[in-house]
């Protein structure tokens, strides 16, 4: 911390300009009025201050606003935002999407920092839900943002916001997250026709139940193998060979290359071998002809 010393004669800052880069830390502390700094924050970003000088400027703002900065200052923090701690940010009340964008721009190209995570958390909590515009903004800066949320947090995403989601935004989502997002996507896209609907819903299908996959198999969707491999194993297992053949269309041939991987491996084990043989792909491991299949889970439930 810089000790308090009187400002040398003639050095009192009348505005925030480049002459301040020639000030020593103690001179900045003594000669720059915090209220002036707050009203001219936008100028700070165009001046190549050292990190040490920025520390002094931050200290001055902290003294002026011990309860947290007003949004008029936050919006113009620019690269001074990188000096803020999560504790500082928790004191803020950020309501404007423009403010959020301005601060995300500063961190652009970098991993999501604890500061940014705290900022987003404060912003979303303030809004009460992840509306479409917010989601649009966040996924533009951080494509993996959606998948960083817990299923509980995702439950606050309204179906209307799903329109903002791009396939790459879901790349790192796990099944628990897709379980929450899929019903929202289904609701969001429900008024679309078959082929358009499938294009939109495709990246969410990792959360689809068996009955929805059965329904899709009746619509000539030609699901690709990459999508099929991301489906829930428990949703795939009850599908018949005929249903999988209809679901995949011409892509059914790809099953052979994936026969050792889930969910294909587990699905093969549940099918009758003679049904698998009808595909003509040489898939092996099905239930031999003449064997009786007992559903042990059903038996356990009865006993």
């Amino acid at each position: 911390e810089v000790e308090k010393t009187a400002c040398p004669s003639g050095k009192k800052a009348r505005e925030i300009d480049e002459s301040l880069i020639f000030y020593k830390k103690w001179e900045l502390e003594a000669c720059v009025d915090a209220a002036l700094l707050a009203t001219q924050m936008d100028r700070v970003n165009a001046i190549p201050f050292t990190y040490e000088q920025l520390d002094v400027l931050k200290h001055k703002l902290d003294e002026l606003y011990p309860q947290g900065y007003p949004e008029s200052v936050i919006q113009h923090l620019g690269y001074l935002f990188l000096k803020m701690s999560p504790e500082d940010i928790r004191k803020w009340n950020v309501t404007s999407l423009e403010t959020l964008k301005a601060l995300l721009e500063v961190n652009k190209g970098h991993e999501m920092s604890p500061q940014v995570a705290t900022l987003i958390d404060r912003f979303v909590k303030g809004r009460g839900q992840l509306d479409k515009d917010t989601l649009d903004t966040l996924t533009a800066f951080y494509p993996g943002y959606l998948c960083s949320l817990s299923p509980e947090e995702l439950s606050s995403v309204p179906p209307s916001s799903i329109w903002a989601v791009r396939p790459q935004d879901l790349d790192t989502c796990d099944p628990r997250q897709l379980d929450v997002l899929y019903p929202k996507a289904r609701l969001a896209f429900q008024n679309m026709n078959g082929s358009e609907y499938f294009v939109k819903i495709q990246s969410f299908l990792g959360g689809a139940p068996t009955e929805d996959l059965k329904a899709l198999s009746q619509q000539n969707v030609s699901m690709d193998l990459a999508t099929f491999m991301k489906l829930r194993t428990d949703a795939v297992l009850p599908l018949t060979v005929a249903e999988v053949q209809k679901l995949l269309g011409p892509h059914v041939e790809g099953l052979k290359a994936e026969e050792r991987h889930r969910p294909v491996r587990d699905w093969i084990l549940r099918q009758r071998q003679d049904d698998l043989d009808t595909l003509g792909l040489g898939l092996q491991g099905g239930i031999p002809n003449g064997y009786l299949v007992l559903d042990l889970s059903m038996q356990e439930a009865l006993s």
Partner: nanobody
């Protein structure tokens, strides 16, 4: 995205050096540039400044009349011409860029060493 300084070295008092600050990975056109120096055990201090357009320059009192800053946007480089060097000019000189799109970017170089002895 980085700034690379060069041109430092050992020079006798009264001699001259020209330092360069070159940007790689981004264009300097929209950035204001500052030259700073840090002598061993001392606080880093501002030496010179040039605006993004090149129309405005400024200098620390200790170097006025001896140092001159200029920029060549075509070469993506800013220069610091240092004449009549003194032993107290010794230090590591680094450049910083501030501004860019939305005034939200800044970059620092690693520095180049100047010894006047």
């Amino acid at each position: 995205l980085q700034l690379v300084e060069s041109g430092g070295g050992l020079v006798q008092p009264g001699g001259s050096l020209r330092l360069s600050c070159a940007a790689s990975g981004f264009t300097l056109d929209y950035y204001a540039i500052g030259w700073f120096r840090q002598a061993p055990g001392k606080e880093r201090e501002g030496v010179s400044y040039i605006s993004s357009s090149g129309g405005s320059t400024n200098y620390a009192d200790s170097v006025k009349g001896r140092f001159s800053i200029s920029r060549d946007n075509a070469k993506n480089t800013v220069y610091l011409q240092m004449n009549s060097l003194k032993p107290e000019d010794t230090g590591v000189y680094s450049c910083a860029a501030a501004g860019g799109y939305g005034n939200s970017s800044r970059h620092w170089g690693q520095g180049t060493s100047v010894t006047v002895s």
